[in-house]
């Protein structure tokens, strides 16, 4: 697993560097998670041909993965800091059940999958500190999440592989949009 943000050799070699601001820490955390996702995607793509598959729509019907849309206020046109921050936190909380699903899906990258999951929890905490309107953030229902997890784990092998691929791809895209939006804040 990669070294968590703030613990890389560059930081160690530069003890007089200014401490990271809240925004820099969030940015670094997201990029750390994105690096982890890249490693997981490599294993998924090497193991199966899911990354080139045109049958994604079949599996996508079973999933309700968070997506960024214009109404969420995260794009340059119609940018709204508070609305966008609520969307990012809500989306990350919704992704948690899917990240839990990923935990037993990797052989050589088991540690990496755990690192992505734990780093996402830390990212949510960072963002919650930044948000003013925590009441607007809806937390997913644990019972609904539990039944979704059971349903996903009961899929056949092909659908499980496709689900893994789609979760990683969607999470990467959501994080990249979040990164871009957070840099405007």
């Amino acid at each position: 697993a990669p070294v968590p943000p703030g613990e890389d050799s560059k930081d160690v070699a530069a003890p007089h560097r200014q401490p990271l601001t809240s925004s820099e820490r969030i940015d670094k955390q997201i990029r750390y998670i994105l690096d982890g996702i890249s490693a997981l995607r490599k294993e998924t793509c090497n193991k199966s041909n899911m990354c080139e598959s045109s049958k994604e729509a079949l599996a996508e019907n079973n999933l309700n993965l968070p997506k960024m849309a214009e109404k969420d206020g995260c794009f340059q046109s119609g940018f709204n800091e508070e609305t966008c921050l609520v969307k990012i936190i809500t989306g990350l909380l919704e992704f948690e059940v899917y990240l839990e699903y990923l935990q037993n899906r990797f052989e050589s990258s088991e540690e990496q999958a755990r690192a992505v999951q734990m780093s996402t929890k830390v990212l949510i905490q960072f963002l919650q500190k930044k948000a003013k309107n925590l009441d607007a953030i809806t937390t997913p229902d644990p019972t609904t999440n539990a039944s979704l997890l059971t349903k996903l784990q009961a899929q056949n092998q092909w659908l499980q592989d496709m689900t893994t691929h789609l979760i990683l791809r969607s999470f990467k895209e959501f994080l990249q949009s979040s990164l871009r939006a957070l840099r405007q804040m």
Epitope: K28, M68, A69, S77, Q176, S177, Q184
Partner: antibody, heavy 120, light 106 residues
């Protein structure tokens, strides 16, 4: 071969409209960030706009905001720059390019550029 | 927009010289900075990205450093083919460029 083929430049009167095209081959625009950069005669490079492949989210430089629209047609693997209310200061060579990697860090593939002249 | 300020605008040097070009961002951009070389009538070509990573195929005499707001491009020993215009570009948000540094023969 990975390349970007540009078209659509030309001479246009102030206040007019023009659409530039940039056709990609060797990679898919649906999974890459794309960008337009321009260069006025004898001047430096200026970032115009970029389009993030996810959700087609576009960003514009202040100098073109509200006048230029960057879009894409995934089926044609092509990105466009629709330029309206053109001004003399929009004259220059327009380059289409691809942002390298996901973060993104630099422009690794460039088109050859297309000349836009705004003059009466 | 993030404003990138490059200096000097013009630099006169001789083959074998060591030259340094600087670039300053109007806000912190971490290490999201690239350096390009452009020759007349040609599209720019990337030399350095992420502030200090040398692009594959680019000679090792080119090097980059810096993070946050201040960055430098160094050419350790100028070669005849290095006389061109150099630009920095940030990729933190959007992709604004510095105004360029024309490196000419003294």
């Amino acid at each position: 071969e990975v390349q970007l083929v540009q078209s659509g430049g030309g001479l246009i009167q102030p206040g007019g409209s023009l659409r530039l095209s940039c056709a990609a081959s060797g990679f898919t625009i649906s999974s890459n960030y794309m960008i337009w950069v321009r260069q006025a005669p004898g001047k430096g490079l200026e970032w115009v706009s970029d389009l993030y492949y996810y959700a087609g989210d576009t960003y514009y430089a202040d100098s073109v905001k509200g006048r230029f629209t960057m879009s894409r047609d995934i089926s044609k693997n092509t990105v466009y720059l629709q330029m309206n209310s053109l001004r003399a200061e929009d004259t220059g060579v327009y380059y289409c390019a691809r942002w390298a990697d996901d973060h993104p860090s630099h422009l690794d593939i460039w088109g050859r550029g297309t000349l836009v002249t705004v003059s009466s | 927009d993030i404003v990138m300020t490059q200096s000097p605008s013009t630099l006169s040097a001789s083959v074998g010289d060591r030259v340094t070009i600087t670039c300053r961002a109007s806000q912190g951009i971490s290490s999201w900075l690239a350096w390009y070389q452009q020759k007349p009538g040609r599209a720019p070509k990337v030399l350095i990205y992420k502030a200090s990573t040398l692009e594959s195929g680019v000679p090792s005499r080119f090097s980059g450093s810096g993070s946050g707001t201040d960055f430098t491009l160094t050419i350790s020993s100028l070669q005849p083919e290095d006389f061109a215009t150099y630009y920095c570009q940030q990729s933190w948000l959007g992709g604004s460029f510095g105004q360029g540094t024309k490196l000419e023969i003294k």
